[in-house]
Interface confidence: medium
């Protein structure tokens, strides 16, 4: 796969994943629960990171936000933080990667600058994806271990709601948002990895492109006291050599204009 294709695909995959992370964060169905189920009426409670909702088979639906921070579990706060961090990093990653795309020319930005930006955006996407996956997994663990509070207990900090305590500890099941979050986090992670791989293709590898020219002129002798500097580049002061024009010539033969290069 070409570098441009890898970079472009990585960007698109990350973009889709990022959109999924936002969707999962905003969704109400992080956990679902059958409150009441009989042949006449079914009542479902589903909770998100920001609000709790109730839906009945009759069509009635009501959602209410968590207006307080005091009554909310610390784990829920942590999940919120992880998802927000993931979104913020994703936004930065997208902005950076737009400028890093090889197919987009911005001024005189060279490949090495684009490579650095591609790597940066790739790392940002990877961290963003990891944040989302961890956030969703922490929430899922809360459900599995039955740590999640009952509907009534969720609002204990909201102006006298503490009196509303359900005696039965209710078990919630995984909501759609968890699966969206896992997939989205995975896609963002994969996209980030692809961006990092594309970065390697964009980076000019110095070790592979050290150009050493061979001249027919009489100025260059076969042997110098400093070692085989002219022919092999392993002279005593080779450490300070710079590469010009993508490895076209070394500092030592800056004045000469060779016609043929050997890459060692």
């Amino acid at each position: 796969m070409s570098v441009t294709a890898c970079q472009g695909l990585g960007f698109v995959v990350s973009l889709i994943g990022f959109a999924g992370i936002i969707a999962a964060t905003c969704m109400d169905q992080w956990s679902t629960q059958d409150l009441y189920n009989n042949p006449v009426t079914a009542v479902f409670n589903y909770q998100g990171l920001w609000r709790s909702c109730v839906r009945e088979s009759s069509g009635f639906t009501e959602c209410r936000g968590y207006f307080t921070l005091l009554g909310l579990p610390a784990m829920l706060q942590a999940v919120r933080a992880l998802m927000i961090v993931g979104i913020v990093l994703g936004v930065i990653g997208i902005l950076v990667s737009i400028f890093a795309l090889k197919c987009i020319r911005i001024g005189s930005m060279d490949d090495s600058a684009k490579a650095k930006m591609t790597l940066t955006s790739g790392i940002l996407f990877i961290i963003s994806g990891i944040c989302a996956i961890i956030g969703v997994s922490v929430f899922a663990n809360m459900l599995v271990t039955n740590f999640w509070m009952s509907t009534a207990n969720m609002y204990s900090g909201m102006g006298g709601m503490g009196g509303m305590v359900q005696t039965v500890q209710t078990r919630y099941t995984f909501g759609a948002a968890l699966f969206v979050g896992w997939v989205a986090g995975g896609l963002t992670l994969i996209g980030g990895v692809m961006m990092c791989i594309a970065c390697r293709g964009l980076t000019p590898d110095d070790s592979n492109f050290k150009a050493v020219s061979y001249h027919a002129s009489g100025q260059n002798v076969a042997y110098r006291p400093g070692g085989f500097k002219a022919s092999t580049g392993f002279g005593s002061n080779t450490r300070n050599k710079k590469i010009y024009d993508g490895g076209a010539r070394t500092e030592d033969d800056e004045q000469s204009h060779p016609t043929k290069y050997d890459y060692v």
Epitope: L35, S52, V54, F60, G159, M164, V165, V168
Partner: nanobody, 122 residues
Framework: EVQVQESGGGLVQAGGSLRLSCAAS????????VGWFRQAPGKEREFVAA????????NYADSVKGRFTISRDNAKNTAWLQMNSLKPEDTAVYYC???????????????WGQGTQVTVSS
């Protein structure tokens, strides 16, 4: 702590009307949805109607749709159940309850009144 108290029950002829009131004490009344439930002798408690905390949405049992109307005034800490075209089968003890959602699920409601008797004679 919120406390609710129903009033307005009584004996009425079939086809008649009654208006039940639910008065709540406590500043947090506006935080709660208000639900009305009823229990006839020898039967389970059943959902009648509910109104959301803001009054913006209502929920009715199929058996009372079009006949009963629920409303509230948060400034007065009061909710009402206007019952029209009453039938003998509407005879029951009517309970007012405060909960987080205006759902038909009685487990959602944490605060309950003592109930008021409504009798519809044929």
């Amino acid at each position: 702590e919120v406390q609710v108290q129903e009033s307005g029950g009584g004996l009425v002829q079939a086809g008649g009307s009654l208006r039940l009131s639910c008065a709540a004490s406590g500043r947090t009344f506006s935080n709660y949805a208000v639900g009305w439930f009823r229990q006839a002798p020898g039967k389970e408690r059943e959902f009648v109607a509910a109104i959301t905390w803001s009054g913006g949405s209502t929920n009715y049992a199929d058996s009372v749709k079009g006949r009963f109307t629920i409303s509230r005034d948060n400034a007065k800490n009061t909710a009402w159940l206007q019952m029209n075209s009453l039938k003998p089968e509407d005879t029951a003890v009517y309970y007012c309850a405060g909960g987080f959602f205006a759902t038909s699920y009685s487990g959602n409601y944490g605060y309950w009144g003592q109930g008021t008797q409504v009798t519809v004679s044929s």
